[in-house]
């Protein structure tokens, strides 16, 4: 059994989440990633359900309770997401800092849109997207 | 030349961000897309971007001196990142909008941890991962 | 200060066993992975194996799997190499490592190292 | 399999710069830290460079890291180049599974 799994149900305690009734409405994220197969999609997905638990994490940080915990799986969501890879791990932590209300973040971020879009979608690489892939208004 | 070009142009006078001195102090994004080859982990570190540019392009939405843009460019993101996919846009966004000081998604997010942990690595499907492959702490 | 002391090398014959110990101080031993690498005489560095700070989760260099188990005891701030199975080109100087923070990345602190001779 | 290459030995005279190449072969260099280590003869080898630019406290500006993803090479850079600097060199990085070092580089002062 992997190391995260009895520090999670101890989080399940501390957070009252065993109970049945949690999963009343539907799911947040496990629905969500039964829609997608396809490994590019599913670490779009991934990305963001990744960055939310740390910042749940982050946000309990002070309660001793649970650190052992919250470190462990931490411990386990970097090898298994980030494939035990520091700069990966602190890449994606740079991006989830940013504060999207900060003057020069925001200069930056329109500085460099183009090229980012440039690189966005995976044919990018090749300029092999053509124009007729192009139908979405949203 | 795709649309968005004349558009971000646009958004580049209106921030300011045109200028030269807007590049000091290293990039946000391009940096850090230039460390992934590899189409999963560039679709990990693109994911928080578009969030980033997502939530630039909402809080300026009352703005009409740029509305055409956002929404031009809105649009072209749709059809690079999220391939013309309104289903894929749209857990995108719903991802993206949970609130992780909401208690009941606090409690969902506890109740689901074990289930989505199992699915993160991308041979977890298939029953392959190795424990030798595990390490890491973060 | 940090300190890593490494015990356990000798002379053993092919086939034969060993179990490297290295003690560990000055840090908080379960915060960080450490890693075993190893230095054949008059050759470079080859990493041998690592192990999170948990314990939960090892990692082997491939010409070591299968042969070589890494494990700590984090209440005596201890780590272990057991090395079955020796062969002749096992023979090295054994380094004990801390990582520089709690993951495969980066060997901050060494030890002065344990000789491992596999000769018959 | 990822690897990192490189020159068995290099050599310079005091005060001048000396460059120590370390190119990866079959993977992407920048998609993991790449680290430098100094073993002088008869020690263990201690970490000068990490994470591809930053210095641990202690050790002189005088050396420095840098990355090329053009070349897909990292560099370990000596300057004003002292006796004290004749040693062995590594650099290392990792891949999804395992922790590489280069074959180390012999640095010789005349």
């Known amino acids: 059994q992997d190391p995260y799994v009895k520090e999670a149900e101890n989080l399940k305690k501390y957070f009252n989440a065993g109970h049945s009734d949690v999963a009343d409405n539907g799911t947040l994220f496990l629905g969500i990633l039964k829609n997608w197969k396809e490994e590019s999609d599913r670490k779009i997905m991934q990305s963001q359900i990744v960055s939310f638990y740390f910042k749940l994490f982050k946000n309990f940080k002070d309660d001793q309770s649970i650190q052992k915990s919250v470190e462990t799986i931490k411990e386990d969501m970097n090898v298994k997401f980030f494939n035990s890879n520091k700069k990966k791990r602190d890449d994606f932590e740079k991006l989830t800092n940013y504060s999207v209300t900060d003057l020069n973040v925001q200069r930056k971020a329109i500085h460099e849109l183009i090229q980012v879009m440039a690189e966005l979608s995976p044919a990018a690489k090749t300029g092999k997207r053509k124009r007729s892939q192009m139908l979405f208004r949203g | 030349q795709d649309p968005y070009v004349k558009e971000a142009e646009n958004l580049k006078k209106y921030f300011n961000a045109g200028h030269s001195d807007v590049a000091d102090n290293g990039t946000l994004f391009l940096g850090i897309l230039k460390n992934w080859k590899e189409e999963s982990d560039r679709k990990i570190m693109q994911s928080q971007i578009v969030s980033f540019y997502f939530k630039l392009f909402k809080n300026f939405k009352d703005d009409q001196s740029i509305q055409k843009s956002v929404e031009t460019i809105k649009e072209d993101m749709n059809v690079k990142f999220f391939n013309s996919n309104k289903k894929k846009r749209d857990d995108f966004e719903k991802l993206t909008n949970y609130s992780v000081t909401d208690l009941n998604v606090q409690r969902k997010a506890i109740h689901e941890l074990i289930q989505v942990m199992a699915e993160l690595s991308p041979a977890a499907k298939t029953g392959k991962r190795k424990r030798s492959q595990m390490l890491f702490r973060g | 200060e940090v300190q890593l002391l490494e015990s356990g090398g000798g002379l053993v014959q092919p086939g034969g066993s060993l179990r490297l110990s290295c003690a560990a101080s000055g840090f908080t031993f379960s915060s960080y992975a450490m890693s075993w690498v190893r230095q054949a005489p008059g050759k470079g560095l080859e990493w041998v194996s690592a192990i999170s700070g948990s314990g939960g989760s090892t990692y082997y260099a491939d010409s070591v799997k299968g042969r070589f188990t890494i494990s700590r005891d984090n209440s005596k701030n201890t780590l272990y190499l057991q090395m079955n199975s020796l062969r002749a080109e096992d023979t090295a100087v054994y380094y004990c490592a801390k990582d520089g923070w709690n993951a495969l990345g980066w060997l901050e602190s060494w030890g002065q190292g344990t000789m491992v001779t596999v000769s018959s | 399999n990822f690897m990192l290459t490189q020159p068995h030995a290099v050599s310079e005279s005091p005060g001048k710069t000396v460059t120590i190449s370390c190119t990866g072969r079959?993977?992407?260099?920048?998609?993991?830290?790449v680290q430098w280590y100094q073993q002088r003869p008869d020690s263990a080898p201690t970490l000068i460079i990490f994470e591809d630019t930053q210095r641990p406290s202690g050790v002189p500006t005088r050396l420095s890291g840098s990355i090329d993803t053009s070349s897909n090479s990292a560099s370990l850079i000596i300057s004003s180049l002292r006796t004290e600097d004749e040693a062995d060199y590594y650099c290392?990085?990792?891949?999804?599974?395992?922790?590489?070092f280069g074959g180390g580089t012999k640095v010789t002062v005349l």
């Open positions: 290392q990085s990792s891949d999804s599974n395992r922790v590489l």
């Open positions: 079959n993977g992407n260099i920048a998609s993991n830290y």
